[in-house]
């Protein structure tokens, strides 16, 4: 594979002329300090740009906002500030875009010093706005019911929960002293409330409430709550155990009607739980270590969210600021990347290809030298910079990037050695979901994926003004440069429509002349670089997770393998906005790898067999499930959630109802009489950090 100066790279003929004819400059007559962008709808071409200039004076902030609207993917903008009556919009709330293609937009105004507030709402993709007075001051961005965009939920700065069923025209107060509120499935609202205190002092004494009728009635589904989170089909709550300051995780898969205790370690006051990722099959849970270690343990759940298997030790997750590098590689099923804090306090990257079953180091890129962190100059790994490096102000402009429709592609900053290096990183690319890597660009860059992987665009990260963009049509093997302006600009960001289906990229920045600066954007349309639509001959069959072509189980992950039709690297053509990933699954035979260890069992390191936990040997395996004492007959295995294997190895498993009552419902956790308290289930974990970056839940 070649990089920028690859010998085998020949440039696309006439690329500069084609791009020059498709480069659109827009100068904003605007001196504002910040700009936020939002795409309204999918494939509409509508972008809203909100610029904000604000100055804090004593206890209030005064400022000015301008609103601009584009209907052509950012090629031109119209100043539509008059639509919002020249009102100062709170930039911390951003632009709230409605779900799906509803065309709804909410802007929250800053009405300093008043008891109420004002919102501007649009139902026509920002063409027109009407303003509505709010009888409260929002504490955070108003949220839409994901299934009905007319229904809005808001938490006020006095911790009142408010609801509107008519897109903000009328509001009713649902509840007082609400600490956290979230939309569940089918219009359900979950929230924690403190009936006799405040949110700040009394965490751990909260009630978890549920309403399924927009606040006409409420049901208390749990008590003594510290925090709660939703992930996939699971509702999690961290609950005070009655043993002083300890908390435990409880889980429900029926919206809180019944609960079970998760087989995870309890945590103390200084620790936390965090859902790193969740879907309808399973959850990744981080459990913080005691003390200020900056790491914890990742556990993966069974399909009920009850039994957990230890997945990864010493997982980096700082309590200060709550930074973790945990990343779902969305371009390949089952792949996740994260960082561990090793014994010598260096940070190393780990990757799993089987949904947390096994973690390994990233393979060293070919043609890369091991850096100074490597003890052995011939043996080292690639280490990826993600959120933690960014929080440490390393020269890392972007987190790792992958897109579901750009199959197999992962782009990230990294260094090659025994651990993450503080030296200036380079950009690496994988075209097979993280199995193999190649250095793509020298030094730090901003990057984005266009046309479902048909084009990758990059801009060098520099403190100096820039005027050159780089692009590749062969998944980062060969690069061409294009000078998009004669007058370099101070670059602030690359913007492309979410979903990586667009062929337009906007370069945002500002120009500086004596005493003034103004915002400028350059939008480049690559449609003429990819002149024709891709045809059948442009695609080739690619087997995901292939590690050994001679093995007839090659590519089998979670019980099935997938063959994809992927664009040939040599094909320069448009996938197009309507491109749908073509994949063909085939079922694999079951092996022990397709099973996790059941309740009361664990896997010794480097062994695929599950063995009985010593402390449970000779004991009946009885545990509390849905309020009944259950007796488990098992040889130690339970199928991994989402695993589709058939035939092959088939361990026997049977659960018998012992017809005995027991309580795992933590509405009264002190009555818990199940024999399975603690971490008998292969030890497991959860997280009460529910809102950190893309993390599903952090306490």
């Amino acid at each position: 594979r070649s990089t920028e100066q690859g010998e085998s790279c020949s440039g696309l003929l006439g690329a500069d002329a084609k791009l020059a004819g498709n480069t659109h400059q827009h100068i904003f007559n605007d001196l504002s300090g910040s700009v936020s962008l939002a795409w309204v709808g999918d494939g509409t071409g509508v972008i809203l740009a909100l610029t904000t200039f604000q100055v804090p004076i004593f206890m209030i902030t005064i400022g000015q906002s301008k609103l601009y609207r584009s209907e052509d993917y950012g090629k031109s903008f119209e100043d539509v500030t008059n639509l919002i009556n020249n009102t100062f919009i709170r930039s911390d709330f951003g632009i709230a875009i409605g779900p799906e293609n509803s065309g709804k937009v909410i802007l929250t105004a800053d009405v300093s010093g008043s008891h109420g507030s004002r919102i501007f709402v649009s139902s026509d993709f920002g063409k027109s706005f009407t303003h509505q007075e709010l009888p409260f001051v929002p504490l955070m961005q108003i949220t839409y019911n994901p299934e009905n965009s007319n229904v809005l939920l808001a938490l006020s700065n006095k911790n009142e929960l408010w609801l509107s069923e008519d897109f903000g025209t009328n509001w009713k107060k649902l509840y007082d002293t609400v600490c956290l509120a979230k939309w569940g499935r089918k219009g359900t609202i979950f929230f924690t409330a403190n009936h006799n205190g405040s949110c700040s002092n009394d965490r751990g004494m909260l009630e978890l409430e549920r309403t399924t009728d927009y606040g006409k009635s409420f049901k208390t589904v749990a008590s003594k709550i510290y925090s709660f989170g939703l992930g996939g089909k699971f509702l999690f709550a961290s609950v005070m155990t009655g043993k002083g300051t300890l908390r435990a995780i409880h889980v429900s898969v029926d919206d809180g009607d019944t609960w079970n205790m998760a087989q995870l370690p309890s945590v103390g006051q200084e620790q936390f739980y965090s859902i790193l990722a969740a879907n309808d099959d399973m959850v990744f849970m981080h459990v913080d270590e005691p003390g200020d270690t900056g790491f914890g343990t990742i556990f993966t759940s069974d399909d009920r969210g009850i039994v957990y298997s230890k997945s990864l030790d010493r997982h980096l997750y700082t309590t200060t600021g709550g930074e973790t590098d945990f990343t779902n590689v969305t371009s390949l099923r089952g792949v996740y990347i994260t960082s561990v804090l090793s014994e010598d306090n260096s940070i190393q990257t780990m990757i799993t290809f089987d949904q947390g079953g096994r973690w390994t180091h990233l393979r060293k890129p070919e043609n890369s030298e091991c850096d100074a962190t490597a003890k052995n100059k011939n043996e080292c790994s690639l280490h990826i910079h993600a959120s933690y490096s960014i929080s440490q102000k390393l020269n890392v402009p972007m987190a790792p990037l992958s897109e579901p429709n750009a199959v197999g592609i992962v782009i990230a900053h990294g260094s090659v050695g025994d651990a993450i290096s503080v030296m200036v990183p380079d950009v690496y690319i994988s075209d097979d979901g993280g199995y193999s890597w190649t250095k793509m660009l020298e030094g730090p860059h901003y990057y984005t994926i266009l046309d479902s992987g048909g084009i990758i665009v990059a801009i060098e990260h520099s403190s100096r003004p820039i005027n050159v963009i780089k692009f590749s049509t062969d998944e980062g093997q060969c690069w061409q440069t294009y000078t998009f302006t004669r007058d370099p600009i101070y670059f602030t960001g690359l913007a492309s429509e979410p979903g990586a289906r667009s062929m337009n990229i906007s370069i945002w920045g500002f120009t500086e002349s004596f005493l003034t600066s103004q915002w400028v954007s350059y939008t480049i349309d690559f449609k003429d670089i990819l002149e024709r639509n891709c045809e059948e001959k442009d695609y080739t069959i690619w087997l995901a997770h292939s590690t050994d072509p001679e093995d007839y189980e090659d590519g089998c992950i979670l019980g099935y393998k997938e063959q994809f039709l992927r664009l040939r690297k040599s094909s320069v053509c448009q996938n197009g906005r309507d491109y749908v990933v073509t994949k063909q699954p085939s079922i694999c035979l079951c092996s022990l790898e397709d099973f996790l260890c059941d309740f009361g069992y664990y896997r010794p390191e480097n062994d695929s067999k599950c063995v009985e936990q010593p402390e449970l040997k000779g004991h009946d395996l009885e545990f509390c499930l849905y309020g009944r004492e259950e007796h488990l007959t098992t040889n130690g295995y339970r199928k991994i959630p989402g695993d589709k294997c058939q035939g092959g190895v088939n361990p026997v498993r049977e659960v018998k109802d012992l017809k005995k009552k027991c309580t795992s419902n933590f509405l009264s956790p002190e009555k818990q009489n199940s024999k399975s308290n603690g971490s008998a289930g292969g030890s497991g974990g959860l997280n009460d950090i529910f809102e950190a970056q893309k993390i599903e839940w952090h306490e």
Epitope: S546, P549, E550, D551, Y552, K561, Q563, Q584, P585, L589
Partner: antibody, heavy 120, light 107 residues
């Protein structure tokens, strides 16, 4: 020219043994998985056995498991099939076939076949 | 085991006519389906691999399509030399299996 040539077939009594050989030429034998496929008179094709390039993966059809043994000698560019406890239903033309280098690839090169007759 | 059902078993066709042979798998095999031609008293020869990829040296009148469970081999304009048995073969799952074959005869 890429070529596979089978030998070792013949007439054998039920319960008897036979060893088939396949000589490869014209390609890097040690880089490919190899297979035996058979065809009973007037019938279709039936896969018998498979061996990976370094012999780490060996697979058999249920009908021959425990009776047939596949092996290879990369130094001699040769593939073998040791057939024991032969039955009348093993009567067929036995083809040696190379598997392409891709995952789940096809049999891209076939030998001319050698006839095995099991009869008393 | 994955069963491959080929149809028709037999086809008598005049030259220049289009021939279509189908192969149905008992469960999804992705694109891991290959087609072979076997002329009388000869060994099989690979025509199409991975459902639609023509093998080198195979005349362009032979084409394949399909994925998952349903596959088709098409001979666009039959020639006399195409009289043979045609077999589909799946390599997705052990045991490897072949279809029962389709015998194409020239009228």
């Amino acid at each position: 020219e890429v070529q596979l040539v089978e030998s070792g077939g013949g007439l054998v009594k039920p319960g008897g043994s036979l060893r088939l050989s396949c000589a490869a030429s014209g390609f890097t034998f040690s880089s490919y998985s190899m297979n035996w496929v058979r065809q009973a008179p007037g019938k279709g094709l039936e896969w018998v056995s498979s061996i990976s390039s370094s012999s780490s993966y060996i697979y058999y059809a249920d009908s021959v498991k425990g009776r047939f043994t596949i092996s290879r000698d990369n130094a001699k560019n040769s593939l073998y099939l040791q057939m024991n406890s032969l039955r009348a239903e093993d009567t067929a033309v036995y083809y040696c076939a190379r598997r392409g280098s891709g995952s789940y690839d096809a049999f891209d090169i076939w030998g001319q076949g050698t006839m095995v007759t099991v009869s008393s | 085991e994955i069963v491959l059902t080929q149809s028709p078993d037999f086809q008598s066709v005049t030259p220049k006519e289009k021939v279509t042979i189908t192969c149905r798998a008992s469960q999804s095999i992705g694109y891991s389906l290959h087609w072979y031609q076997q002329k009388p008293d000869q060994s099989p020869k690979l025509l199409i691999k991975y459902a639609s990829q023509s093998f080198s040296g195979v005349p362009s009148r032979f084409s394949g399509s399909g994925s998952g469970t349903d596959f088709t081999l098409t001979i666009n304009s039959l020639e006399a030399e195409d009289a043979a048995a045609y077999y589909c073969h799946q390599s997705s799952s052990l045991p490897l299996t072949f279809g029962g074959g389709t015998k194409v005869e020239i009228k």
